[in-house]
């Protein structure tokens, strides 16, 4: 059909009455309707509602509403329903993104890595290695690296420095009251139930989609620790796969204070004599790397010279 004409108030379109040959300027029909009868020399155009399963998004001069897109294929869900004004729009459910015309789960950033960019329905999560002063102790597709507990601000000292995968362990010097102190030569390290260690093979592998240039290659910043170890060693809290620790390591008079912070406990050790700790960092093998590219679902776009 010949081109449409613009109008300031209500949109118009040009229609050729093929019987008479006349080129007519007719008022467009509102969105959600179509032109069931074009205007003539003596009559206005007639608009009718789009039948079920069809739609028009804009005011228009078309003779048939557009067919809605096919129902959403599993596992996609409807973002917008098929209605007179809107085409059906499909999207991925929460925790997934569009990949190759279907939905894939968002990447889970492994321990030692945090979310750099949140995943959306069309883009995967982007992970980054936890920077200095931060850690991630759980695999997650939503959590960022968390800052180490600031022991000093709580009038505590760092018993064990944090790594990319673990928080600082803080401790205090309790009063030297013999009645409250455990017997020398014993230390008790109750571990909160949820604190499991993740045995991930040591490797230099950088997860797909996890930008190694953004991670810290140097060791974590070491917070201040009390110097001059008198006796004992720091328990190795990554040695056990299921959190059962040796309780008879020779560290004097330690008490653990459990501080619950958000969904994850941080444990703080109350230390009687001072000690110095050195902590290492572990590189971790990722659980899953991100997908590349962002395929789009068929948007079922329509263009008609008589549809705005």
């Amino acid at each position: 059909q010949p081109e449409q004409k613009a109008s300031n108030l209500i949109g118009t379109y040009r229609h050729v009455d093929r019987a008479t040959g006349q080129v007519l300027t007719c008022d467009k029909c509102p969105a959600g309707t179509y032109v069931s009868e074009h205007c003539t020399n003596t009559s206005l155009r007639v608009c009718s509602s789009c039948p079920v399963g069809t739609f028009t998004r804009h005011e228009n001069g078309i003779e048939k509403c557009h067919d809605c897109s096919q129902p959403c294929p599993w596992p996609m869900i409807e973002k917008l329903p098929c209605a007179a004004l809107t085409d059906r729009e499909c999207t991925c459910p929460p925790g997934m993104f569009q990949s190759n015309a279907t939905c894939a789960p968002h990447t889970v950033c492994p321990v030692g890595w945090g979310v750099r960019k949140k995943g959306t329905e069309t883009e995967d999560v982007r992970c980054k290695q936890c920077a200095r002063g931060t850690f991630s102790d759980v695999p997650s597709s939503v959590m960022k690296c968390k800052a180490y507990t600031d022991c000093l601000s709580q009038n505590l000292v760092v018993i064990k420095p944090g790594t990319k995968e673990t928080d600082n362990v803080c401790g205090t010097l309790p009063s030297f009251s013999s009645s409250t102190s455990p017997s020398p030569g014993t230390a008790i390290f109750p571990r909160p139930e949820h604190m499991e260690t993740h045995e991930v093979p040591s490797s230099t592998y950088v997860p797909k989609g996890m930008n190694s240039t953004e991670s810290n290659s140097s060791a974590s910043v070491r917070p201040k620790v009390l110097s001059s170890i008198q006796e004992g060693t720091v328990p190795d809290n990554t040695s056990s796969a299921r959190g059962k620790e040796d309780v008879n390591k020779t560290l004097p008079n330690l008490q653990v204070v459990n501080h619950q912070q958000g969904p994850h406990h941080r444990h703080i050790l109350k230390l009687l004599p001072s000690m110095e700790a050195t902590g290492g960092e572990k590189s971790s093998t990722p659980i899953k790397g991100p997908k590349r590219g962002h395929p789009r679902q068929n948007l079922h776009k329509h263009f008609d010279i008589n549809e705005h």
Partner: antibody
Framework: QVQLQQSGTELARPGASVKLSCKAS????????LNWMKQGTGQGLEWIGE????????YYNEKFKGKATLTADKSSNTAFMQLSSLTSEDSAVYFC??????WGQGTLVTVSL | DILMTQSPPSMSVSLGDTVSITCHAS??????IGWLQQKPGKSFKGLIY???TLEDGVPSRFSGSGSGAEFSLTISSLESEDFADYYC?????????FGGGTKLEIK
């Protein structure tokens, strides 16, 4: 009233070309499409194509592409159809029409040696 | 192309009779059909367009009906000037196509 006045009878040799005219009056020439139709002996009626003088849009029947060329002159309110490479098959009465309702009187084209 | 099948090809009728001519389209054409009259040695006159709209100056004894693919032209109380050839034409789709015509003769 609306009138479509067509040019007179054409006698042409095979291989030649003819240009038929159709002068419109009684309406705004640039507001309507003009069609050309062919009525051949024993061939029934055929639509050749149409032209919109207001924008020089043309639409042709595939069968007549290369055979017919439609033009219009707004200054004289006249539409033209040129028929080229004539053969005996082109012998017919040709009508210009406004839409399908208003018809000119027709032009007889005879192609013979 | 849309094929327009017109029937009957010819019919003999008497003055005052009512006649119907039909056209069948090979596919749906909504109401995009016109009816034309041609008298011997003359040009065409448009009678009906958009299926049922009477052209200015055409007597009301002519009427058109139908939609989709089946259409008819009805002439009631035939008068002598009505004896002529009648054609249907579809303009729903390029190329426009015509029925083969119906010759109306006096019985």
């Amino acid at each position: 009233q609306v009138q479509l006045q067509q040019s007179g009878t054409e006698l042409a040799r095979p291989g030649a070309s003819v240009k038929l005219s159709c002068k419109a009056s009684g309406y705004t020439f640039t507001d309507y499409y003009l069609n050309w139709m062919k009525q051949g002996t024993g061939q029934g009626l055929e639509w050749i194509g149409e032209i919109y003088p207001g924008g020089d849009h043309t639409y042709y029947n595939e069968k007549f592409k290369g055979k017919a060329t439609l033009t219009a002159d707004k200054s004289s309110n006249t539409a033209f159809m040129q028929l080229s490479s004539l053969t005996s098959e082109d012998s017919a009465v040709y009508f210009c029409t406004r839409g399908v309702i208003k018809w000119g009187q027709g032009t007889l084209v005879t192609v013979s040696l | 192309d849309i094929l327009m099948t017109q029937s009957p090809p010819s019919m003999s009728v008497s003055l005052g009779d009512t006649v119907s001519i039909t056209c069948h389209a090979s596919q749906g054409i909504s109401s995009n059909i016109g009816w034309l009259q041609q008298k011997p040695g003359k040009s065409f006159k448009g009678l009906i367009y958009h299926g049922s709209t009477l052209e200015d100056g055409v007597p009301s004894r002519f009427s058109g009906s139908g939609s989709g693919a089946e259409f008819s032209l009805t002439i009631s109380s035939l008068e002598s000037e009505d004896f002529a050839d009648y054609y249907c034409v579809q303009y729903a789709q390029f190329p426009y196509t015509f029925g083969g015509g119906t010759k109306l003769e006096i019985k």
